[in-house]
Interface confidence: low
């Protein structure tokens, strides 16, 4: 699913307001819910008809450091006797994600947001048939 | 997939820089890579072994305001004959991501980043058996 | 100085409504997100309803949800509850009341009511 | 909503005594727990927040504890400003629900 574009508003002060100095704001330290976690059931990337891996990027000056990426392993979906059956497609599911960059210039550190496309997982879907005219 | 905890070292300075005050940096006005759009497979939701129903939750003091939740149609899978299959299961991904919370106290604006879980969509996958002793 | 005034009280039959209005003054309303807490005679205080800022979403006890509804109108700096359906349960001292943060030390923020109006006063009997 | 269970419902104490008041949630909360003081036709004042920490102004002789599900509020030695019902209130989530309040009454 797709993040809007911020716009011109959030991260504006209200209009009775002083103007944001020099284009930044104060971003508090700390996470809110920073220690919610995902509970998927296990093992679905192999254990799914559109089964797929997981490759891990890793950047310092980003967070979170780590991003992890599937791939769909397959063209067409794992039926019942375990056979590719190309009749059905796996097809990856992806998310717009937010990360925050780290941006050094000697001693004056500043962070801004970024839009990260993540590949969540894969699934099996009936194809779209073009019928030729 | 889980995003990590902050720990202690991202959004500080080197250690022989001043520290931050006041627990706040500065957050760059502006989004990396904005424009980035996803390009999933048309009406997946639907056309999925495992279909699943979009929720929108929306909050203007976070940014994206709109955050998009999926649910599972079925408990099992859609078969070739589009009926339902509980011998398999359809089962969410789910997808740690963050968020920018906006907090008011007057006209001091600032800003802090909440982690949300969010289901992205759903996968047919074979079901654990638990096989009794 | 930062105040909050409510109004609108009164002695209202089972089954009646009310609305309360709470007149904000001294801060920029817009800015904050406000509550209504409620204390019956000789009880505890009740958080009943909860609006965010833009607009945003409301939240209410379960005890008058479906019942009660807050608004807010930041062009006359007001805070609303429309409470219909009344039961002699809901006979209490109503309170308009300021949401605000204090950042804790581990960065988190903690909220907390921090203006409080002096109350109006609602009446559910026959 | 999360309940929040104050205990006791009163109590009665002399000046330089010691009080403590226990407050439990139905869910974990974390350290999202405010304590406030309410005297009669005046507002409630917060006292502590994030469970343990006081609020500026506040005299060191309150103090509070506890993380999770179980917190304690404690006035170390009973001033007779400190008469007045004591409300726990938790923050974890957007209805800020309080607990059933202990009326601190002179012996």
């Known amino acids: 699913r797709k993040i809007p574009k911020v716009g011109h508003t959030f991260f504006q002060k209200p209009e009775s307001c002083p103007p944001v100095p020099g284009g930044s704001m104060k971003l508090d330290i700390g996470i809110i819910n920073e220690n919610q976690r995902v509970s998927m059931s296990r093992n679905i990337e192999s254990r799914s008809t559109s089964p797929w891996n997981y490759t891990v990027t890793w950047d310092p000056n980003r967070y979170p450091s780590e991003v992890v990426q599937a791939q769909c392993r397959n063209l067409g979906c794992i039926n019942a006797q375990g056979k590719e059956d190309i009749s059905m497609n796996s097809v990856p599911i992806q998310q717009e994600t937010l990360v925050v960059r780290r941006k050094h210039q000697g001693c004056s550190v500043s962070f801004q947001l970024e839009k990260v496309l993540v590949t969540v997982g894969c699934t099996c879907v009936t194809p779209v048939i073009h019928h030729v005219q | 997939r889980k995003i990590p905890k902050v720990g202690h070292t991202f959004f500080q300075k080197p250690e022989s820089c001043p520290p931050v005050p006041g627990g706040s940096m500065k957050l760059d006005i502006g989004i990396i890579n904005e424009n980035q759009r996803v390009s999933m497979s048309r009406n997946i939701e639907s056309r999925s072994t495992s279909p699943w129903n979009y929720t929108v939750t929306w909050d203007p003091n976070r940014y994206p305001s709109e955050v998009v939740q999926a649910q599972c149609r079925n408990l099992g899978c859609i078969n070739a004959q589009g009926k339902e299959d509980i011998s398999m299961n359809s089962v969410p991904i789910q997808q740690e991501t963050l968020v920018v919370r906006r907090k008011h106290q007057g006209c001091s604006v600032s800003f802090q980043l909440e982690k949300v879980l969010v289901t992205v969509g759903c996968t047919c996958v074979t079901p654990v058996i638990h096989h009794v002793q | 100085e930062v105040q909050l005034e409510e109004s609108g009280g009164g002695l209202v039959q089972p089954g009646g409504s009310l609305r309360l209005s709470c007149a904000a003054s001294?801060?920029?309303?817009?800015?904050?997100?406000m509550n209504w807490v409620r204390q019956a005679p000789g009880k505890g205080l009740e958080w009943i309803s909860y609006i965010s800022v833009s607009g945003g979403p409301a939240h209410y006890a379960d005890s008058v949800k479906g019942r009660f509804t807050i608004s807010r109108d930041d062009a006359t700096k007001s805070l609303f509850l429309q409470m219909n359906r009344l039961r002699a349960d809901d006979t209490a001292v109503y309170y308009c009341?300021?949401?605000?943060?204090?950042?804790?030390?581990?960065?988190?923020?903690?909220?907390?009511?921090?203006?409080w109006g002096t109350g109006t006063t609602v009446t559910v009997s026959p | 909503d999360i309940q929040m269970t104050q205990s006791p419902s009163s109590l009665s104490a002399s000046v330089g005594d010691r009080v403590t008041i226990t407050c439990r949630a139905s869910q974990t909360i974390s350290d999202y727990l405010n304590w406030y003081q309410h005297k009669p036709g005046e507002a409630p004042k917060l006292l502590i927040y994030?469970?343990?920490t006081l609020q500026r102004g506040v005299p060191s002789r309150f103090s509070g504890s506890g993380s999770g599900t179980d917190f304690v509020f404690t006035i170390s030695s009973l001033q007779s400003d400190d008469f007045a019902t004591y409300y726990c209130?938790?923050?974890?989530?957007?209805?800020?629900?309080f607990g059933g309040g202990t009326k601190v009454e002179v012996k």
């Open positions: 001294g801060f920029p309303f817009s800015n904050y997100e």
């Open positions: 209130q938790q923050t974890s989530s957007t209805a800020l629900t």
């Open positions: 994030s469970a343990s």
């Open positions: 009341v300021r949401r605000e943060y204090v950042t804790g030390r581990n960065y988190n923020y903690y909220p907390y009511m921090d203006v």
